[in-house]
Amino acid sequence: KSPVFGPQEVSSVEGNSVSIKCYYPPTSVNRHTRKYWCRKGASGRCITLVSSEGYVSSNYAGRANLTNFPENGTFVVNIAQLSRDDSGHYKCGLGINSRGLSFDVSLEVSQGPELPNGTEVYTVDVGRTVTIKCPFKTENAPKTKALYKKIGQTSVLVIDSRNYVNPNYKDRIRLRIPGTGQLIFTVVIDRLRLSDHGLYLCQAGDGSNRDEKNADLQVLEPEPELVYEDLRGSVTFHCALGLEVANVAKFLCRVNSRETCDVVINTLGKRDSAFEGRILLNPQDKDGSFSVVITGLRKEDEGRYLCGAHSDGQLQEGWPIQAWQLFVNEESTIPRSPTVVKGVAGGSVAVLCPYNPKESQSLKYWCLWEGAQNGRCPLLVESQGLVQEQYEGRLSLLQEPGNGTFTVILNQLTTQDAGFYWCLTNGDTRWRTTVEIKIIEGEPNLKVPGNVTAVLGETLNIPCHFPCKFSSYEKYWCKWSNTGCQTLPSQDEGPSEAFVNCDENSRLVSLTLNPVTRADEGWYWCGVKQGHFYGETAAVYVAVEEKKVAGSRYVSPAKADAAPDEKVLDSGVREIENKAIQDPRLFAEEKVVADTGDQAGGSRASVDSSSSEEQGGSSK
């Protein structure tokens, strides 16, 4: 299917002008190639009428032009002084006329209505309000005022000053007669319907002295705004319906093949399941305007969308609406990032998030989509640090690998972490993406002891067991802080035969803190990576206490994979009972340890990677 997109139907009246905007993927080639507007003939050939290279056909001379906007990926064709002869089938496109990089546009130019002299024309969008002004002479001031609608040769009474209201206008029409001295009455019609379209007649008085005024009411369906977005990207519909419906329920719906409109989301809590995890209805402003964001755009999301207001939260005739025609470009610049990432309970996930690579300096964010009511997405972490305290020690956002991708690591997974998350930046909003985290059955690959207590001034050794499948990857320990995870210096003692062959059930990478200081308190992560790509991580909390007894503190490698509810009391180490203590304040006195940067600098902290049989080995 062609990636060029424009309006399918354009209609106007003789003598008027039209402006036709066509969209194209703004690749370097497309931006600079020829743009054209051509008319399809009976033979199927398309004859150029105007092009970006300066050509204008004789038929269009002096009344048409084509302007390219390469930075937006659009071009606009303006045609003035329209005549009935301009009605027909056209194409806007790129390159050569027959190549197929084009979009079909139907232009219909109709004759303007034959209106009686002095007719006032009112042009109003459906759902809005019109005020029809009706002048009268002094002698008709005390007489009956009325508004009729002309249907064929007959006139049907709509409203009069004797309190008659036509049932079709019930609860949405009023006739106002001003005070003395003002020789004009007004008829206000709210929530206009398409059926209200037509010629009206104001009348004051009767007989040959009556005052009459013709009013032509044109009720228009809102012209859909064309929206051109990339596959997998994000779209925002801004909906401003006016103060008069500020307190009425709002909705966004999509027009289906039966020309009815299926609710996508509304403020009453309804949401189409096809948009689960990837839609938000942003709160209303005081003026009643709101916006709807949809991420992870799919080809099947294409179509006509309407936003509106009604107490039922769905489309009803005569209520204000706004319209969009969404086109989803399959020649997307947005990469196919994961829609689902799976992790095991107790384990971790490393989520890769795409961003516009031209915006490497932009702030990166990760939020949790919540479906309740209109949906919301509270930020959990940003590139400058953690946002939500309850994720302390288990969430980090890394700028790596860079060049259009950042990484979010979440560990200590529980079933509560299952759900939808959004990758965002403060730059190009079209690059918002959604990922679903699923918790599956299985065991974490990395095994670390539960939370440990270290003694000031002594040596602490924390083992991390990894399986053979990770043997060829880089292993690391890092100290978590709310601004990231600072890698600790590693000791690479060269690979041993046993390590290279990985003939044991598991391998060991150990963190040594020597001597332990107050600043060492906190969360530590053991992880595997390949270059800038992160795999599994496991977290352990180290509490620091005053020296009570002599002797070094050491978590025995042999006991490091003890079950979570076991206590490892080897070599004088006391392990905190596993009570799912995610928050260190529950067992460490209320003390804030400032992150001093390289807290494990110099030779104080070291990482040793070895087999469980020998202390030699490699961390690579």
Epitope: P335, R336, S337, P338, T339, V340, V341, K342, G343, V344, G347, A350, V351, L352, P354, Y355, P357, P401, N403, G404, T405, I440, E441, G442, N445, K469, F470, Y473, V528, Q530, F533, Y534, G535, E536
Partner: nanobody, 138 residues
Amino acid sequence: QVQLVESGGGLVQAGGSLRLSCAASGRTFSSYAMGWFRQAPGKEREFVAVISWSGGSTYYADSVKGRFTISRDNAKNTVYLQMNSLKPEDTAVYYCASGEQPGSNRPYIPEQPIEFMPTDYPSWYDYWGQGTQVTVSS
């Protein structure tokens, strides 16, 4: 939806070879990692091998390492399991499975090692075939 159909199973003598195929249809085959599992009577489903979406990364169960080779042909939407030096304990129903793999196209989301994902657990996979019987006689 993705539909998976296995073929190539049969009866073979110990020390012999078989080549299993799994043809996929439906959604984009090239964005899925493909795995093989097996289930012997009265036993749990066991991981055999997995291959990343590009074919650039593979991972095998210790019990088949060096004997089995997994490969894929994205043009044909097919994944293969070449089984050599077969043993009686390889007798089982072999299942093909597919799971969406993070980083399944370029330019900005490169491929992560398949070992970084919990692909040895059946619950990681989204779609399964009906299975093909492999019997190794002694």
